[in-house]
């Protein structure tokens, strides 16, 4: 487990290091999961780089915020916001928020405790 | 069915200690986060403090911190809140509450809730 | 002062609907939970809804959560007398690594 550096990381601070790092990895990663690796997800050029690669690259990424729990939900609720409207119906937006839950512990950080990742506003 | 006793409460001098216990039955008690809610004289609820199944993590409200401390004994059913250092604001009933607080994508909410006991700090 | 911000006060005829809001912040209800509870005059508060929107078993589905943003509202349908009592919000704040409850909103049922 990384190092706790803050103990909940302040909302504003947390708000400046999710809009600086790049989640696309993340959503990729995520998104090759659900969809088994098929093809028919073109939204991404998802082909060019393996889900253990995109894997450590979203990782990476989120290594680059403050490692505390407040954070985390931030970048955790920004990607299902980003992935949403791609979401095509109730499964398989319930498919991604199980391997967005996965996610903290795959890259060995702590899971956001009470993150409410419904936060689309009905979208999702 | 799910019972939650608190006993303890009493008039006490600005400075003294209190320790509130509550009793619990009816459900697995080790399985489930616990809680204090306070409720001051005709004012609204306040959270106070909240206990980890285990024991192993605590939160405490700031004013409280440091006067406070919340404990459980898993194998008597029971919670308790040892208050030092007591002053006239935390004059209020003492509710003792089960928080429904599960994994990390759930909130705390508080499903089950005792009749209180009446803390008064005063000289 | 309650960080997180309900109406003191709302009134409404039987059988009617009303709404209570419930306005935070990014750090509380932006991010987490919300819960609703009812207190009636010299009782212990009561669980309305959990987790925004869930009811648990024996509330009638007469009352109703939602979240939007940093705002969470619970809603009330085919009012009774009985349900004159004080409403309170609550949810965790992660800033403060604390739960907060709103400053509760007193429903009159005229």
């Known amino acids: 487990m990384r190092r706790e550096r803050g103990r909940q990381g302040d909302s504003s601070s947390c708000e400046r290091q999710v809009d600086r790092v790049n989640l696309k990895p993340c959503e990729q990663h995520i998104m090759q999961r659900i969809m088994g690796e098929q093809e028919q997800y073109d939204s991404y050029d998802i082909r060019s780089t393996r889900s253990s690669d995109q894997q450590q690259r979203c990782c990476d990424e989120l290594n680059e915020m403050e490692n505390t729990q407040r954070c985390m939900c931030e970048a955790l609720q920004q990607i299902m916001e980003n992935q949403c409207d791609r979401l095509q119906d109730r499964q398989m937006v319930q498919q991604f928020k199980r391997e967005l839950m996965n996610l903290p512990q795959q890259c060995n950080f702590r899971a956001p405790q009470r993150c409410d990742l419904d936060v689309s506003g009905g979208r999702c | 069915e799910v019972q939650l006793v608190e006993s303890g409460g009493g008039l006490v001098q600005p400075g003294g200690s209190l320790r509130l216990s509550c009793a619990a039955s009816?459900?697995?008690?080790?399985?489930?986060?616990m809680t204090w809610v306070r409720q001051a004289p005709g004012k609204g609820l306040e959270w106070v403090a909240n206990i980890k199944q285990d024991g192993s993590e605590k939160d405490y409200l700031d004013s409280v911190r440091g006067r406070f401390t919340i404990s459980r004994d898993n194998a008597k059913n029971s919670l308790y809140l040892q208050m030092n250092s007591l002053r006239a604001e935390d004059t209020a009933v003492y509710y003792c509450?089960?928080?429904?607080?599960?994994?990390?994508?759930?909130?705390?909410?508080?499903?089950?809730w005792g009749q209180g006991t009446l803390v008064t700090v005063s000289s | 002062q309650s960080v997180l911000t309900q109406p003191p006060s709302i009134s409404a005829a039987p059988g009617q609907k009303v709404t209570i809001s419930c306005s935070g912040t990014g750090s509380n209800i932006g991010h987490n939970y919300v819960s609703w509870y009812q207190q009636l005059p010299r009782t212990a508060p009561r669980l309305l809804i959990f987790?925004?929107?869930k009811r648990p078993s024996g509330i009638p589905d007469r009352f109703s959560g939602s979240k939007s943003g940093s705002s969470a509202t619970l809603g009330i349908t085919g009012l009774q007398t009985g349900d004159e009592a004080h409403y309170f919000c609550a949810t965790w704040d992660a800033d403060l690594s604390a739960v907060l409850f709103g400053g509760g909103t007193k429903l009159t049922v005229l």
């Open positions: 509450t089960r928080n429904g607080l599960q994994d990390s994508y759930s909130g705390d909410f508080f499903d089950h």
């Open positions: 009816g459900f697995k008690f080790s399985t489930f986060y």
């Open positions: 987790d925004n929107t």
